[in-house]
Interface confidence: low
């Protein structure tokens, strides 16, 4: 019996199969090399091609960059000669591996180039405060085009517990209405999480030193944020509106929200952050007017008036 040559084991033909590929979303920083991976098996040997945003992409024909393309592989690495070259290569990539039996296709690989956020280096002096007094620990994250999330943690990466007395504001600062000796720690760290770049950066730790006192002096409330007595802001129709009031004092003040011009739209209002934040979902024309926060304790009160003007989006 004669077995045709093409039926011998090592001559069996196989259609292409993608065996390795880059993750579907990939973020590169300005100084990073760009490496896109695509490996495939198949007999006869597969040929590779790439598309970027649906258009044929030939890495080796790109100008002003050095390209290393692995032999017998679809993978390639692009190295730039300036700090901003990665921006040029943003897009959606796809690898195609073909032989005479067919074509296998990688998933879409979205390549995003981002500037690496950095906190300016600074020397953070210890913050010294007497028990019962108020204090604000600043965060001041670097500016970012994308939304970021702020966390305050200690060096053990445990969240700083927040309550009526200790609050993080929308601006990222950590506010203490009054400090206790138990707040005495050398490692208050503000973390900024930039989701789009999968990056967390952290500020230098702040050393909060609380001096014990025999008798804490009661203080009537004072607003730490906003600091003035009133403010005017414009809200866009259909968008959410967030108002915030953070107070200091001893005993710890409580916050109430009032609307002198009419009833609060209870079905669309939520109070967060131990009542320090009022969020109005989907602003309408009828939400125009004054919103007042009132910080109260046994010694008195402090207030802030927000004058809201609603405009068409």
């Amino acid at each position: 019996i004669q077995i045709p040559e093409e039926y011998e084991g090592h001559h069996v033909m196989e259609p292409p199969v993608i065996t390795e590929q880059s993750p579907r979303r990939l973020v590169v920083f300005p100084t990073d090399d760009i490496s896109l991976k695509c490996e495939a098996s198949g007999k006869p040997e597969v040929q590779f091609r790439w598309t970027r945003d649906g258009v044929h992409f030939k890495p080796k024909e790109e100008l002003g960059v050095t390209v290393y393309q692995s032999p017998h592989s679809g993978s390639f690495t692009i190295t730039g000669n300036n700090s901003n070259f990665a921006q040029r290569f943003q897009g959606i990539y796809r690898c195609f591996a073909s032989n005479k039996l067919g074509t296998a296709m990688s998933h879409e690989i979205r390549l995003m180039a981002e500037g690496a956020p950095k906190w300016p280096k600074e020397t953070v002096k210890p913050v010294e405060v007497e028990e019962g007094e108020s204090v604000v620990l600043p965060c001041n994250p670097p500016p970012s085009a994308e939304p970021l999330r702020i966390y305050w943690m200690n060096s053990k990466i445990l969240h700083i517990k927040q309550d009526e007395r200790v609050t993080m504001g929308q601006n990222g600062n950590l506010y203490f209405a009054n400090v206790l000796t138990s707040d005495n720690h050398s490692d208050y760290i503000c973390h900024a999480h930039f989701p789009g770049t999968r990056t967390i950066i952290q500020k230098e730790p702040i050393d909060l030193r609380v001096k014990a006192t025999n008798s804490m002096i009661d203080r009537k409330p004072r607003l730490l944020f906003p600091t003035n007595s009133s403010s005017h802001l414009v809200a866009l129709q259909g968008q959410p509106l967030v108002l915030e009031c953070i107070a200091e004092g001893f005993p710890t003040p409580t916050i109430k929200w009032l609307r002198p011009s009419g009833p609060m739209p209870a079905d669309r209002v939520t109070y967060q952050n131990h009542n320090k934040t009022l969020q109005l979902l989907k602003v309408g024309e009828e939400d125009d007017g004054e919103y007042r926060c009132l910080a109260e304790n046994s010694l008195g009160s402090a207030r802030h008036a927000y004058y809201v003007t609603v405009e068409a989006a």
Partner: antibody
Framework: QVQLVQSGSELKKPGASVKLSCKAS????????MQWVRQAPGQGLEWIGE????????NYNEMFKSRAVLSVDTSVSTAYMQLCSLKAEDTAVYYC???????????WGQGTLVTVSS | DIVMTQSPDSLAVSLGERVTMNCKSS????????????LAWYQQKPGQPPKLLIY???TRESGVPDRFSGSGSGTDFTLTISSLQAEDVALYYC?????????FGQGTKLEIK
């Protein structure tokens, strides 16, 4: 704080459709992909698909591609999942989950139980 | 699709003891360019949604106790609880997010002996 609140339980007959909602608050709705995952009684977790609320872009598990439709209404920060041609084996708790920048699902809704029975 | 296989299916461990559970993927989850493994671990208690414990195979989610740790690279991963507490009784799932469709392991049920 981030919250995902899902619609209530549903009882459906085989062949029917169901549309579940997931209302998001406490973050910028258009910033993160929304995932849908299901869990049949006593079973493991199964990924259905995801939607990018900023542009409506979707990715589906092939298993569900012909029957599931993901959508969003950014004006009310709500994501929806519609599943049609329901079968008894679609009885499950359906979760929406937020896909943070770390590419893992770090916030989840409380789940919606869908029961398919004749 | 990438297949995730967890072992064991269930285990019973005494309080205070060390717990290890494994997760194996059918293909590598390591992306060489950023040296990240695209793997997460979740904890699920009855009647609750899953809770993220670990992402990128070894990075603990903020607020998760430091007795939980993740290790491994490529195709073999481990979740370790250094000292079992009563509140750790739950189902644990691994999940890959390297390639579509995302896939989960079948789960490991952890009980107290």
């Amino acid at each position: 704080q981030v919250q995902l609140v899902q619609s209530g339980s549903e009882l459906k007959k085989p062949g029917a459709s169901v549309k579940l909602s997931c209302k998001a608050s406490g973050y910028t709705f258009t910033s993160y992909w929304m995932q849908w995952v299901r869990q049949a009684p006593g079973q493991g977790l199964e990924w259905i698909g995801e939607i990018n609320p900023s542009n409506g872009r979707t990715n589906y598990n092939e298993m569900f591609k012909s029957r599931a439709v993901l959508s969003v209404d950014t004006s009310v920060s709500t994501a929806y999942m519609q599943l049609c041609s329901l079968k008894a084996e679609d009885t499950a708790v359906y979760y929406c989950a937020l896909y943070d920048g770390y590419y893992a699902m770090d916030y989840w809704g409380q789940g919606t139980l869908v029961t398919v029975s004749s | 699709d990438i297949v995730m296989t967890q072992s064991p299916d269930s285990l019973a461990v005494s309080l205070g003891e060390r717990v290890t559970m494994n997760c194996k993927s059918s293909q590598s989850l390591l992306y060489s360019s950023n040296q990240k493994n695209y793997l997460a671990w979740y904890q699920q208690k009855p009647g609750q949604p899953p809770k993220l414990l670990i992402y990128w195979a070894s990075t603990r989610e903020s607020g998760v106790p430091d007795r939980f740790s993740g290790s491994g690279s490529g195709t073999d991963f481990t979740l370790t609880i250094s000292s079992l507490q009563a509140e750790d009784v739950a189902l644990y799932y691994c999940q890959q997010y390297h390639s579509y469709p995302f896939t989960f392991g079948q789960g490991t049920k952890l009980e107290i002996k």
